[in-house]
Amino acid sequence: ELPKPSISSNNSKPVEDKDAVAFTCEPEAQNTTYLWWVNGQSLPVSPRLQLSNGNRTLTLFNVTRNDARAYVCGIQNSVSANRSDPVTLDVLYGPDTPIISPPDSSYLSGANLNLSCHSASNPSPQYSWRINGIPQQHTQVLFIAKITPNNNGTYACFVSNLATGRNNSIVKSITVSASGTSPGLSA
């Protein structure tokens, strides 16, 4: 009777567009067929997927975030068959280009400015803000109470992912009008 197989990996946290991952189905056995499934489906046809070592090793080249799925290997012979527990690949990616919310760029003096920055990233990115190039707090949300025309300028959200070593940013212009001088938007 065949034992329950397990999956070993040479890279548990690969970086998108940079790393390859090799899964190996353990143990090695004679007269045994090795099979693989991804998210419960048979392996898709892809130039980035390669089976080797008698199908015992599955290699994913140039991993992407879409490879973050559940991988299962199976072994079978003429007597029995067995499957491994799933191993979910944790692909590190991003940070993608951020989005600052809300989209309003014109405000009335006295309003509160509440800007939120979102960037897709694994792991979650570190956020920081700069106003007119001057560093502000390291938070995802920038809040300034009762803004005045002195708060006019460029507001930049910076995101960094220490795991991938990558950074990204987005810049937004904010105009604050004195009350009663412009039909600006209040926050």
Partner: nanobody, 119 residues
């Protein structure tokens, strides 16, 4: 310049489902992040879900995980937000947003589509 047009909103009973669509046009070759936000009456606009236009993947706000699914159809040039098990608290204007990559990145927003959930 990128234009975003949302559709699919409406009035639905609690427990029901909706599929929102966002169709970008213009300089779509530079698209990076595609996201959905929502704004309930009297509340701040909040992030709901996002995907990467070229790479896929998905990230969600904790409040919608398991009920909302973001997806993209490259053949139809459209991003979808499937909303299941709707609750009255999901009532809001849902906005599609996009970021572009390049020497100068930018954000773009649609006009929004109203989702009203009745109990």
């Amino acid at each position: 310049e990128v234009d975003l047009v949302e559709s699919g909103g409406g009035l639905v009973q609690a427990g029901g489902s909706l599929r929102l669509s966002c169709a970008p046009s213009g300089r779509t070759s530079s698209l990076d992040t595609m996201a959905w936000f929502r704004q309930a009456p009297g509340k701040e606009r909040e992030f709901v879900a996002s995907t990467n236009w070229n790479r896929g993947g998905a990230s969600y706000a904790d409040s919608v995980k398991g009920r909302f699914t973001i997806s993209r159809d490259a053949t139809k040039n459209t991003v979808y937000l499937q909303i299941n098990s709707l609750e009255p608290e999901d009532t809001a204007v849902y906005y599609c947003a996009a970021s572009t990559r390049g020497i100068v990145s930018d954000n773009y927003w649609g006009q929004g589509t109203q989702v009203t959930v009745s109990s």
